[in-house]
């Protein structure tokens, strides 16, 4: 219909025409991890904020149990950003029991699962080598892609370690999708 | 037809809808940066070119003062880039007097003013530590993310250290928001 | 009004409306990538799926030999990542007769090509110098941004060093465009 | 090779309007703006007004503000400035000139590239 | 707006000669200002960008200096071919505005 006078008779029909303020949105942002127990060779999914300060879901997409719910089928643009943060510091809150707070790798992974397939698809990873030299190092990794998801699908947020993930500030660490 | 009820036959009412091309954009590129007095534990703001090579604002999103202008309330994709560079020669132009050009961190925030509201709210934190070897390092950080904005909404980027940024080129160093 | 006709009366004149599900997208992932002869100064582009796994596209946006083309003038959303690996073990797959595989730095430029003029003009460049000290190395860049695009336009990437692509999964290294 | 080629001479009466056209070739057009100079007989050059070819925004002189316009089709690769109601001191040479700008912020750059020039005469 | 002044207004030199043109600026246009040759019945063209930059093609004879305020056009060495009128023009702020030209003619 692109440059022309829009204005149809009775007897034509159109292709579905929406409000752009009626599509499923949402951004969501960190909040502090919960330590989880997660299978060996799959990592854990990050939780989030969906309701305070900037984080919304509207318009259907709703947010439950680490997951953003896709509630119509179309094309979204998904993205994530996650900000890692390691301290050599012995006492520091986020050094994980056990673990060297300086990683070889870190890695950000947005995944899809759908009910009728076992199998998650990971839709877009970040993954960097880490060389810092300092004792406390931080950086983030950014993901954002288009994707053609169906109702029901669902969208989660996986990082290589939870402990290296910086929660402190809900503009360092979020998720977010939308309908285009 | 923002905001006007839109029942073209007197049996329907439909929601408001609009054509894509008069959403308000704006897609800003990076200018040498002026020196500029900023307060102490405030980061300063860029400014930013507008309207010359791949720069441009459209639909009432207008650019004035290191700002974008939101002219409608509405959710928006915001996104930014800054490549950082450092170089470790005395006579290098970007360097700034009195202060070590090899800092411990780079930082950019896209932040929102909004005039009835005295303090700003950052919208996107990239932070990263630096710990580069050589004598010339460079690096972006990019941002991108998805808000609900209010008519009268200011948006600015702020660096942590203005004489870092690299202005050279219009495809490095960017600043944009459209509406959803 | 999603699924619903749309047949307003005769007296009322709208601006052009369309279905957001017809608008040209795509969706490209990364494929292994076939030595290329480049001339000197210029990157060389990389060829990607259209339309196997992730890969989609859509609405006459069409694929072909290394250019994503525009079907329709308009505002876009580009967006690119490019996950760079080094390694220094000599047999290494991806390490490239004599270039060293540790380089200076790794560059990735989203550029597009006018038939009616010879020269091509970058819109975005994520670049970004290496010191990774580890003998294995890798890392992403990230970029994505607006532009007001021409029917006819052909867009590309290009890297510094095609050997450094990670081209092992379709989620590391990835193309998109979509009207907006 | 990169050039602007411009309509040719005009003679109106004093009131009415004229529109001189500007066509590119050998470069992308959607990236320079265009500018329009004339030059009185005699004068020297008087900046009239400029025009993004990339999404239409223009900059008018406050002189001309609400007697000029200027457009662009991209499909064509042409840009075009309107001048309405004509005076005798509107006769000039009006030139169309590209707007370079070399993708960094540290330039502004200048007009590199220019029309021939169009004689506009008015006269009753 | 901001106004450009140029001096002189005309002036008469000879071949081999070193000729300066200066232009004033009402407020400081950073380093936006452009330099223009123009010969009779011909379309300007474009010498030094950005004050001190020379467009392309330009001979090496053309320079320009100055920031802020006050900007200077050099020919080292006049040559018959430069007899013409020069123009500066800041690119600072809209409207773009020119100086009212330096007549440079043969002594």
């Known amino acids: 219909l692109k440059g022309q006078e829009f204005a149809p008779s009775h007897q034509q029909v159109y292709a579905p025409l929406r409000a752009d303020g009626d599509k499923p949105r949402a951004h969501l942002t960190v909040v502090r991890q919960t330590p989880t127990q997660h299978f060996k060779n799959q990592f854990p999914a990050l939780h989030w904020e969906h309701e305070l300060g900037l984080a919304f879901t509207k318009n259907r997409m709703n947010y439950t149990n680490k997951f953003l719910l896709i509630p119509e089928s179309g094309d979204y643009f998904i993205y994530s950003q996650v900000t890692f943060r390691g301290m050599t510091s012995e006492s520091s809150e986020i050094r994980q029991a056990g673990r060297p707070n300086k990683p070889d790798s870190i890695t950000v992974v947005i995944t899809k699962v759908t009910d009728s397939y076992p199998e998650p698809t990971q839709l877009l990873m970040g993954t960097k080598s880490v060389s810092e030299v300092g004792s406390n190092w931080f950086q983030p990794i950014y993901l954002g892609a288009m994707f053609s998801l169906q109702e029901g699908d669902k969208l989660m947020v996986n990082v290589s370690d939870i402990s290296l993930v910086d929660y402190t500030k809900e503009d360092k660490t979020f998720f977010g999708a939308f309908l285009l | 037809l923002k905001g006007q009820e839109f029942a073209p036959s007197h049996q329907q009412v439909y929601a408001p809808l609009r054509a894509d091309g008069d959403k308000p954009r704006a897609h800003l590129t990076v200018v040498r940066q002026t020196p500029t007095q900023h307060f102490k534990n405030q980061f300063p703001a860029l400014h930013w070119e507008h309207e010359l090579g791949l720069a441009f604002t459209k639909n009432r999103m207008n650019y004035t003062n290191k700002f974008l202008l939101i002219p409608e309330s509405g959710d928006y994709f915001i996104y930014s880039q800054v490549t950082f560079r450092g170089m470790t020669s005395e006579s290098s132009e970007i360097r700034q007097a009195g202060r070590p050009n090899k800092p411990d961190s780079i930082t950019v925030v896209i932040t929102k003013v909004t005039d009835s509201y005295p303090e700003p709210t950052q919208l996107l934190m990239g932070t990263k530590s630096v710990s580069e070897v050589g004598s010339n390092w460079f690096q972006p950080i990019y941002l991108g993310a998805m808000f609900s904005l209010q008519e009268g909404d200011k948006l600015m980027v702020n660096v942590s250290d203005i004489s870092l940024v690299d202005y050279t080129k219009e495809d490095k160093t960017f600043f944009g928001a459209f509406l959803l | 009004l999603k699924g619903q006709e749309f047949a307003p009366s005769h007296q009322q004149v709208y601006a052009p409306l369309r279905a957001d599900g017809d608008k040209p997208r795509a969706h490209l992932t990364v494929v292994r990538q076939t030595p290329t002869q480049h001339f000197k100064n210029q990157f060389p582009a990389l060829h990607w799926e259209h339309e196997l796994g992730l890969a989609f596209t859509k609405n006459r946006m069409n694929y072909t030999n290394k250019f994503l083309l525009i079907p329709e003038s308009g505002d876009y959303f580009i967006y690119s990542q490019v996950t760079f690996r080094g390694m220094t073990s000599e047999s290494s797959e991806i390490r490239q007769a004599g270039r060293p595989n540790k380089p200076d730095s790794i560059t990735v430029v989203i550029t597009k090509v006018t038939d009616s003029y010879p020269e091509p003009t970058q819109l975005l460049m994520g670049t970004k110098s290496v010191s990774e000290v580890g003998s294995n190395w890798f890392q992403p860049i990230y970029l994505g941004a607006m532009f007001s695009l021409q029917e006819g336009d052909k867009l590309m990437v290009n890297v510094s060093d095609i050997s450094l692509v990670d081209y092992t999964k379709e989620d590391k290294t990835f193309f998109g465009a979509f009207l907006l | 090779q990169v050039q602007l080629v411009q309509s040719g001479a005009e003679v109106k009466k004093p009131g009415a309007s004229v529109k001189v056209s500007c066509k590119a070739s050998?470069?992308?057009?959607?990236?320079?703006?265009i500018s329009w100079v004339r030059q009185a007989p005699g004068q020297g050059l008087e900046w009239m007004g400029w025009i993004s070819t990339y999404n239409g925004n223009t900059h008018y002189a406050r002189m001309l503000q609400g007697r000029v316009t200027m457009t662009t089709d991209t499909s064509t690769r042409t840009a075009y400035m309107e001048l309405r109601s004509l005076r005798s001191d509107d006769t000039a040479v009006y030139y169309c000139?590209?707007?370079?700008?070399?993708?960094?912020?540290?330039?502004?750059?200048?007009?590199?590239?220019w029309g021939q020039g169009t004689t506009v005469t008015v006269s009753s | 707006d901001i106004q450009m002044t140029q001096s002189p207004s005309s002036l008469s030199a000879s071949v081999g000669d070193r000729v300066t043109i200066t232009c004033r600026a009402s407020q400081s246009v950073s380093s936006y200002l452009a330099w223009y040759q123009q010969k009779p019945g011909k379309a300007p063209k474009l010498l030094i960008y950005d004050a001190s930059n020379r467009a392309t093609g330009v001979p090496s004879r053309f320079s320009g200096s100055g920031s802020g305020t006050d900007f200077t056009l050099t020919i080292s060495s006049l040559q018959p071919e430069d007899f013409a009128t020069y123009y500066c023009?800041?690119?600072?702020?809209?409207?773009?505005?020119f100086g009212q030209g330096t007549k440079v003619e043969i002594k």
């Open positions: 000139a590209r707007e370079n700008y070399y993708g960094s912020g540290a330039y502004r750059g200048g007009m590199d590239v």
């Open positions: 050998g470069y992308d057009f959607t990236y320079y703006g």
């Open positions: 023009q800041q690119r600072s702020n809209w409207p773009w505005t």
